[in-house]
């Protein structure tokens, strides 16, 4: 029986040109998360596999940054980024959980909430802690 629930940031807004963190969290289950897929309508943004690291879709590679955690940082926002985003958690043994986030990208200088998230700088203690470039693996 699937007992888990996905918590998301819900409906969020951000300024054009800014950045946003898309974040989901799976709770109320002991299922192991094997992979999280991030999708926008029928487009794949990214995949984070627990063992194999990150895959970033080439159409987003210049403005999507992996993380923090299983989340996704979307940069250089345009009004065309407005829409639904889905985090799809593949778990064992439960199966698949899906969370939904609605992002509105505003032309105005002030977004209601969810604007101006700090983007991780990528400063790490030592080489072994750096995310891998290849398939985006982490140690």
């Amino acid at each position: 029986m699937m007992t888990g629930t996905i918590e998301t940031t819900g409906n969020i807004s951000a300024e054009k040109g800014g950045s946003i963190i898309l974040q989901c969290h799976l709770s109320s289950t002991t299922a192991q998360v094997t992979q999280v897929n991030w999708e926008q309508q029928d487009q794949l943004l990214a995949i984070c596999n627990a063992d194999l690291g990150w895959h970033i879709s080439p159409s987003f590679k210049d403005r999507v940054a992996p993380g923090p955690g299983l989340g996704l940082t979307l940069q250089s926002l345009t009004v065309n980024d407005t829409g639904e985003y889905f985090c799809i958690y593949h778990t064992y043994p439960d199966g698949t959980y899906t969370g939904r986030i609605f992002l509105e990208v505003l032309e105005s200088s002030v977004a209601e909430h969810g604007a101006r998230f700090q983007i991780p700088t990528g400063d790490y203690k030592d080489d072994d802690d750096k995310p891998n470039k290849g398939s985006g693996t982490t140690s």
Partner: antibody, heavy 119, light 107 residues
Framework: EVQLQQSGPELVKPGASVKISCKTS????????MHWVKQSHGKNLEWIGG????????SYNQKFKGRATLTVDKSSSTAYMELRSLTSDDSAVYYC????????????WGQGTSVTVSS | DIVMTQSHKFMSTSVGDRVNITCKAS??????VAWYQQKPGQSPKLLIY???YRYTGVPDRFTGSGSGTDFTFTISSVQAEDLAVYHC?????????FGGGTKLEIK
């Protein structure tokens, strides 16, 4: 230039084990995962699994889990696949393959290692 | 596991022809599909990744399209050197799976 150099052909008896190596050069070994693919009868490809050389984390195809073991030696930038309890169905060519930059598609492949299981 | 079906095991074509090789996934895989070319006695070679992106150095006669469950690999003008087996592969979810391959034969 990225290169994946695999060990030579193997003739093994049923029930035995085989360990294939994949020596890499031309890139930083720990920055890319390494994958293993089986090809039977020159046609069908099957993903066996992949390994993260940074931390040894592995992802296996359930079909091979328990019989296949993926390991790495970071000091020599070499990946290994061991396959145990061999049967004639394991006679195939085995490839190591490396995916791209933040991309799961495998853009570099070894030359393949032929394994023949026969008594 | 996701099953990738290449309905044609063999396709026969002539030099200069346009050829479409299809691949169908048993469930949606978004655009997480790659296409590989394998010539006799050689290792597979990546041609197309993320359904429609041509890999570095691949001639522009090779294109890929599709999303969800239906994918197409196209050679706009077949050359003699295109004699090979073409494999599709999904990497949407592990275990990554391949199609059965389509062998392109030149008349």
């Amino acid at each position: 230039e990225v290169q994946l150099q695999q060990s030579g052909p193997e003739l093994v008896k049923p029930g035995a084990s085989v360990k294939i190596s994949c020596k890499t050069s031309g890139y930083t070994f720990t920055e890319y995962t390494m994958h293993w693919v089986k090809q039977s009868h020159g046609k069908n490809l099957e993903w066996i699994g992949g390994i993260n050389p940074n931390n040894g984390g592995t992802s296996y195809n359930q079909k091979f889990k328990g019989r296949a073991t993926l390991t790495v030696d970071k000091s020599s930038s070499t990946a290994y696949m061991e396959l145990r309890s061999l049967t004639s169905d394991d006679s195939a060519v085995y490839y190591c393959a490396r995916p791209g930059w933040y991309n799961y598609a495998m853009d570099y492949w070894g030359q393949g290692t032929s394994v023949t299981v026969s008594s | 596991d996701i099953v990738m079906t290449q309905s044609h095991k063999f396709m026969s074509t002539s030099v200069g022809d346009r050829v479409n090789i299809t691949c169908k996934a048993s469930q949606g895989v978004s655009t997480a599909v790659a296409w590989y070319q394998q010539k006799p006695g050689q290792s597979p070679k990546l041609l197309i990744y993320s359904a429609s992106y041509r890999y570095t150095g691949v001639p522009d006669r090779f294109t890929g399209s599709g999303s969800g469950t239906d994918f197409t690999f196209t050679i706009s003008s077949v050359q003699a050197e295109d004699l090979a087996v073409y494999h599709c592969q999904q990497h949407y979810i592990t275990p990554w799976t391949f199609g059965g391959g389509t062998k392109l034969e030149i008349k």
